[in-house]
């Protein structure tokens, strides 16, 4: 199956050229997507190419600039946010990245009614998070770990919390582990639908052990970065949820929301908060042993001025075969009655599907079913539910958007995207306006990405928002590799793989094989998406075959595959990569003396273990920023899949699954180990320990560190990294430079 954009065949083959590494490093063939910034049922904002902020009205067809590029430039703004009453815009500048999602910035408020910046009671700097209320123009922001509220942009602020302290107490923003492994956001505060209440989380990191690493910078002495970071089994943050009435916040003060008794009895996490109405809120909690989740619906009691979370409104989700949920526990999408909701969780056959919960989870009505998985609920209106799944044609690596009519009985299902641009588009996401009056579809491939606007009632395409014409033209004279997505059936396990083949691929010839692996729990590498990246170059120019394989532990193919790795990370993921390689060799076009494997992060862990498997399959391999022992990684992530590193739990497998334990087995492979010294996520410690074990075992290996670089190895390091890895692979495969 060739999953590539069709183009007119050029008879003059010599005008076609292969991809170069420079193309990749320069981002020559990057694509654009168009996500409307919806501000009503029929209006959206978009930042034009020349940086004007333009308001589009779909129904009138009119558009006008609400904020000029001149105003944006006057404060060097890189982002903006319109207040819901459309009177003010915040402009964001001085962006300074912290962790994966978090950053600080300077904010200016621009008054659209008089065309001036708001003077007096300006916002402090730098701010950690800022957002408008959902109605009007109240502002909530976090500064120095404390939350502040402004009734109007020009008003003085009201300080809601006072105990915020760097690396100790976090109000309204997550600490490191909650940001990375639980919330996946830079914020931990949530406005109620009409802005009456503001809910926020307080994270107490006082007792968490600190990871410290050197940041070399340019000074005479390096500085030390300290992050409260709970590794597996360590003390975790203590979380509390508060809600404050924003009309008169000085009166009652923040009210703590009670934790369900069955959760509070031992260590626990808060996992998400969903407002239902202004006076009803839904909180999700998770036991530290992450197989029990509780969804708690709480109501505001006006007479008591308190939040009441009755036991009758607690819904328990438990997994007996693995952990609760997929990567995260899913969040509920409430229906119009403000008490029943739709939620994705495993059905009795072990596939994640949409369920409708009216009273108890036990009485849940299953909305979707089949040997495929529902992946995301986008929107529930009074008569429709929009969701994505990988049902169509039984390809787990696809995403199509479906509509279920919930207003009629029996509910009818329609695939909105399956036949729109079938060859070009098999992997979609969507963005809906208020009441799903309109929506944008963003197609990521396998062909060149395209974004389109649709009528929410008829699903009719209204217009193309972005079709990447320039990219299409630029690719016309490029010899792109061929891609195929197929499956292997091995011992009752289905292994889906993507193979990237050189442009002039000939099955009768032998090619070097590079396995690219991630393999982390609930991940998916084999997806029908467009990409022109490093491995595209390796196939196009260097004539390598590249394969990606989704083995046990990966997502969207049912719980049997997903939970197979529960409590034994580092075993089946590696086995399945090896099994796939053996199958690829059997196909006859792989040079079995030239097989390599590489991966980053979890993929670096898997590639290291595969190289040290003792199979003799791999000639060489690369691990970028690998985990080397699960005792070194974050508690929230690690314990979800591995339990605790204690004698009475799973310490034995923690010890058995380290890369260091296999140091001897690296003797017969060429190993390139790479890590950034300022990696806040997978600490440099991981690679330092691998290197130490290899030295102690007197095993030769290659290594590269990137000073002051984090887990992403960005900027100039990226160029150096890919150039270095290219040289390493070409040398391994005896390819001339």
């Amino acid at each position: 199956i060739v999953l590539r954009p069709s183009r007119v065949h050029n008879s003059e083959e010599n005008t076609m050229r292969a991809l170069t590494l420079k193309d990749i490093l320069n981002g020559t063939f990057s694509y654009k997507t168009f996500f409307p910034n919806w501000i009503s049922g029929q209006e959206y904002l978009h930042q034009s190419a020349d940086n004007n902020i333009v308001l589009y009205n779909i129904e009138t067809g009119q558009s006008y600039t609400i904020l000029s590029n001149r105003t944006m430039k006057s404060v060097n703004a890189s982002n903006y946010g319109l207040s819901p009453d459309r009177q003010f815009v915040y402009l964001e500048s001085d962006y300074s990245k912290l962790w994966r999602y978090s950053y600080t910035a300077t904010y200016y408020i621009y008054d659209l009614s008089n065309g001036e910046f708001v003077r007096g009671n300006e916002l402090p700097r730098p701010i950690q998070y800022l957002c408008w209320s959902p109605v009007g123009s109240k502002l909530a922001y976090v500064y120095q770990n404390n939350i502040y509220l402004k009734q109007r942009p020009g008003d003085p602020p009201f300080q809601i919390t006072f105990n915020g302290r760097e690396n100790k107490i976090f109000n309204g923003i997550p600490d490191w582990v909650y940001e990375e492994e639980m919330l996946a956001t830079k914020y931990a505060l949530w406005w109620s639908p009409n802005g009456k209440f503001l809910a926020y989380a307080e994270f107490n990191d006082t007792d968490i052990p600190v990871i410290a690493y050197s940041y070399y910078g340019d000074e005479q002495y390096p500085r030390t970065i300290n992050i409260p970071y709970p590794k597996a089994g360590a003390k975790n943050p203590v979380v509390r949820i508060f809600i404050i009435d924003t009309t008169y916040p000085a009166y009652v003060g923040p009210q703590e929301v009670p934790v369900p008794a069955m959760i509070a009895s031992s260590d626990y996490y808060f996992s998400w908060l969903t407002w239902v109405t202004d006076e009803r809120v839904c909180l999700q909690w998770l036991k530290r042993v992450q197989n029990v989740s509780v969804l708690s619906i709480c109501d505001f009691r006006e007479d008591w001025q308190t939040w009441d979370c009755p036991k009758t409104q607690e819904h328990i989700e438990e997994s007996r075969t693995g952990w609760a949920g997929g990567f995260f526990v899913s969040t509920p999408v409430f229906s119009y009655d403000a008490i029943s909701y739709y939620k994705i969780f495993s059905d009795k056959d072990g596939y994640k599907h949409i369920h409708y919960i009216k009273d108890t989870v036990e009485n849940a009505i299953q909305i979707t079913s089949g040997k495929w998985e529902a992946i995301n609920i986008f929107r529930v209106t009074q008569d429709s539910l929009f969701y994505s799944s990988n049902e169509f044609e039984e390809y787990p690596g696809r995403r199509n958007i479906y509509r279920i009519s919930i207003g009629s009985y029996p509910p009818s299902k329609k695939c909105v995207t399956c036949h729109l641009r079938k060859e070009r588009c098999q992997y979609y996401t969507a963005s809906f306006s208020d009441y799903a009056k309109y929506y944008a579809l963003v197609c990521y491939g396998p062909g060149i990405p395209i974004s389109t606007l649709h009528d929410g009632r008829t699903d009719q395409e209204i217009k193309i928002l972005e079709e990447n014409k320039e990219l299409e033209n630029a690719l016309k004279n490029i010899q792109l590799p061929k891609e195929e997505i197929k499956k292997l059936e091995v011992d009752e396990i289905t292994l889906w793989y993507k193979m990237i083949l050189p442009p002039q691929f000939d099955r009768s010839k032998k090619y070097p094989l590079l396995i690219q692996v991630y393999g982390g729990p609930c991940s998916q590498s084999v997806r029908s998406v467009f990409a022109v990246n490093w491995i595209s170059y390796l196939a196009s120019k260097e004539g390598m075959v590249i394969a990606l394989v989704d083995g046990r532990g990966t997502a969207f193919q049912g719980d049997k595959l997903l939970y197979a790795v529960y409590r034994k990370l580092g075993v089946y993921e590696v086995e399945d990569q090896i099994t796939a390689v053996r199958k690829f060799i059997e196909m006859g076009f792989i040079d079995e003396k030239r097989i390599a494997i590489w991966g980053w992060s979890y993929g670096g862990y898997v590639s290291s273990l595969a190289l040290a498997s003792g199979t003799g399959l791999f000639k060489c391999g690369i691990a970028v920023a690998p985990v080397s022992s699960w005792e070194y990684y974050a508690s929230v992530y690690t314990e979800r899949f591995m339990g605790l590193p204690t004698k009475d739990d799973n310490l034995e497998h923690y010890k058995n699954s380290t890369v260091m334990a296999r140091a001897e087995y690296f003797r017969n492979v060429d190993y390139l180990l790479i890590h950034g010294t300022a990696d806040d996520n997978v600490h440099f410690q991981n690679s330092a320990q691998i290197a130490k074990a290899l030295v102690n075992a007197q095993v030769d290996f290659q290594a590269m560190w990137y000073s002051d670089q984090n887990h992403g190895l960005s900027g100039l390091s990226t160029n150096h990294l890919y150039t270095h890895m290219t040289h390493f692979l070409k040398q391994c495969f005896s390819l001339s430079d």
Epitope: P156, A250, Y251, V252, G253, W304
Partner: antibody
Framework: EVQLLESGGGLVQPGGSLRLSCAAS????????MSWVRQAPGKGLEWVSA???????YYADSVKGRFTISRDNSKNTLYLQMNSLRAQDTAVYYC??????????WGQGTLVTVSS | EIVLTQSPGTLSLSPGERATLSCRAS???????LAWYQQKPGQAPRLLII???TRATGIPDRFSGSGSGTDFTLTISRLEPEDFAVYYC?????????FGQGTKVEIK
């Protein structure tokens, strides 16, 4: 009907201690922030301290380190432990319902006299 | 801390007359955090106005509040005999919350 009843006031020497209590009824005490406000003889009102429903405490600079506010939600009672008392702490002490403002219910007050 | 200055210190008026009490803040106060109280001799204060202009529960409509920023006003449209007392403005914008020194409304 909401009622706040202070007790524990009296005459104390400078440097001495007193513990004021405020018994609350007629509302869900455990859900509300509560404050102590004082009024020196013939003078205006001065906020002293507050405590959230969840127990976080706030103090005026003039009493910080000497006074401790606390609550026992099971007994519906608010306390103010006053140590190292000074002459300028002489006042009628009111317990009030609220955190930093909108004090909608007040007790009748208890007089604290600090004198040698 | 925010200093609230009330004026006049004393207001001598007759029943039935209109009383206008002023409260000036040393720095800007958002309307949501400005309250007014009434206190009679030997009694605890009583909440009159919240959010600068909203009457508290059970407060007669002859009491009204207005203002924003640094200048706030309490108006009693027609003084009743029971209205003669000391009136305090109070801000809850910042810690510590502070009260004005009070305006005494006395019978002329």
């Amino acid at each position: 009907e909401v009622q706040l009843l202070e007790s524990g006031g009296g005459l104390v020497q400078p440097g001495g201690s007193l513990r004021l209590s405020c018994a609350a009824s007629g509302f869900t005490f455990s859900s509300h922030a509560m404050s102590w406000v004082r009024q020196a003889p013939g003078k205006g009102l001065e906020w002293v301290s507050a405590i959230w429903a969840s127990g976080e405490q706030y103090y005026a600079d003039s009493v910080k380190g000497r006074f401790t506010i606390s609550r026992d939600n099971s007994k519906n009672t608010l306390y103010l432990q006053m140590n190292s008392l000074r002459a300028q702490d002489t006042a009628v002490y009111y317990c009030a319902k609220g955190w930093l403002g909108n004090f909608d219910y007040w007790g009748q007050g208890t007089l604290v006299t600090v004198s040698s | 801390e925010i200093v609230l200055t009330q004026s006049p210190g004393t207001l001598s008026l007759s029943p039935g007359e209109r009383a206008t009490l002023s409260c000036r803040a040393s720095q800007s106060v958002s309307r949501s955090y400005l309250a007014w109280y009434q206190q009679k001799p030997g009694q605890a204060p009583r909440l009159l106005i919240i959010g600068a202009s909203t009457r508290a529960t059970g407060i007669p409509d002859r009491f009204s509040g207005s203002g924003s920023g640094t200048d706030f006003t309490l108006t009693i449209s027609r003084l009743e005999p029971e209205d003669f007392a000391v009136y305090y403005c109070q801000q809850g914008q910042v810690i510590p919350p502070t009260f004005g020194q009070g305006t005494k409304v006395e019978i002329k």
